[in-house]
């Protein structure tokens, strides 16, 4: 499935307090489910990977191709 990375943005849409960690914001999230197709405007967001939309946060997230890391799968994984 490649490396799942979360965009650093979180709209806090489901939180009472936007600073509550009610939805993971780590860049190496392995959370499954609750994703939808990325809006068309994020077609080129993920550089070396595929985009999916985090429903709870309404933000794009990248599933990186093997050997790539970063929020946008923009960096080569030197440890790969």
């Amino acid at each position: 499935d490649g490396n799942s990375t979360r965009s650093p943005e979180t709209n806090g849409l489901l939180c009472g307090d936007p600073e509550e960690n009610c939805a993971a914001t780590t860049t190496q999230s392995k959370r499954k489910g609750h994703f939808s197709r990325c809006p068309k405007q994020y077609k080129h967001y993920c550089i070396k990977g595929r985009c999916r939309f985090v429903v709870a946060e309404q933000t794009p997230s990248c599933v990186c191709d093997e050997g790539y890391i970063g929020a946008r799968c923009e960096r080569v994984d030197l440890f790969y």
């Epitope: 943005e9 709209n11 936007p18 809006p39 405007q41 933000t59 929020a71 946008r72």
Partner: antibody, heavy 116, light 106 residues
Framework: QVQLLESGGGLVQPGGSLRLSCAAS????????ISWVRQAPGKGLEWVSY????????HYADSVKGRFTISRDNSKNTLYLQMNSLRAEDTAVYYC?????????WGQGTLVTVSS | DIQMTQSPSSLSASVGDRVTITCRAS??????LGWYQQKPGKAPKLLIY???SLQSGVPSRFSGSGSGTDFTLTISSLQPEDFATYYC????????FGQGTKVEIK
């Protein structure tokens, strides 16, 4: 609490330039996408531009493409909008808003008037 | 570009009324739609996201429905503080707003 405070608006002649700033506080600025949205007097809302949390993914509305530049300084918790070649139709209240797709927090806006 | 068309442009209603505002997209946007409320001289406030999800802190009298091209915002029982202008916004293709619906006191 989350706060966004715009500044830099004012009166400018057609063809002129202006730089807007948006100071953010109350949240971890570097984690969030931020947008500019404008509203002409008595008119509706128009999305202008957004920038992702790292400053590497940017989009503009067709109406401002090639004239406006969005940027951010995460060390200063500040968003910018450099506006060049201003036109009368750019006259509006400019809001910065948190988010790229949806806008859950907004500033109070700063008025830009383009007139000779 | 995706155009968003709201109807009606304005409406008059009384406190306690059920109010419905519709928004139509020029092409399918799945459920990538938000609703905002704006009062004169103030910034907009997010009410609904993903077509039907209520934003935190928003009263439950507000609800959204629809998918594809046709969407609805419903206020089940209009309150005095609800008199305002409402905007829909699509975020599938680059973000665009509807022209707004002004809800006035009858």
């Amino acid at each position: 609490q989350v706060q966004l405070l715009e500044s830099g608006g004012g009166l400018v002649q057609p063809g002129g330039s202006l730089r807007l700033s948006c100071a953010a506080s109350g949240f971890t600025f570097s984690r969030y996408w931020i947008s500019w949205v404008r509203q002409a007097p008595g008119k509706g809302l128009e999305w202008v531009s957004y920038i992702d949390s790292t400053g590497t993914f940017i989009h503009y509305a067709d109406s401002v493409k090639g004239r406006f530049t969005i940027s951010r300084d995460n060390s200063k918790n500040t968003l910018y909008l450099q506006m060049n070649s201003l036109r009368a139709e750019d006259t509006a209240v400019y809001y910065c808003a948190r988010g790229g797709s949806l806008f859950d927090y907004w500033g109070q806006g700063t008025l830009v008037t383009v007139s000779s | 570009d995706i155009q968003m068309t709201q109807s009606p442009s304005s409406l008059s209603a009384s406190v306690g009324d059920r109010v419905t505002i519709t928004c139509r997209a020029s092409q399918g946007i799945i459920s990538y739609l938000g609703w905002y409320q704006q009062k004169p001289g103030k910034a907009p406030k997010l009410l609904i996201y993903a077509a039907s999800s209520l934003q935190s802190g928003v009263p439950s009298r507000f609800s959204g429905s629809g998918s594809g091209t046709d969407f609805t915002l419903t206020i089940s029982s209009l309150q005095p503080e609800d008199f305002a202008t409402y905007y829909c916004q699509q975020y599938d293709a680059l973000n665009t707003f509807g022209q707004g619906t002004k809800v006035e006191i009858k």
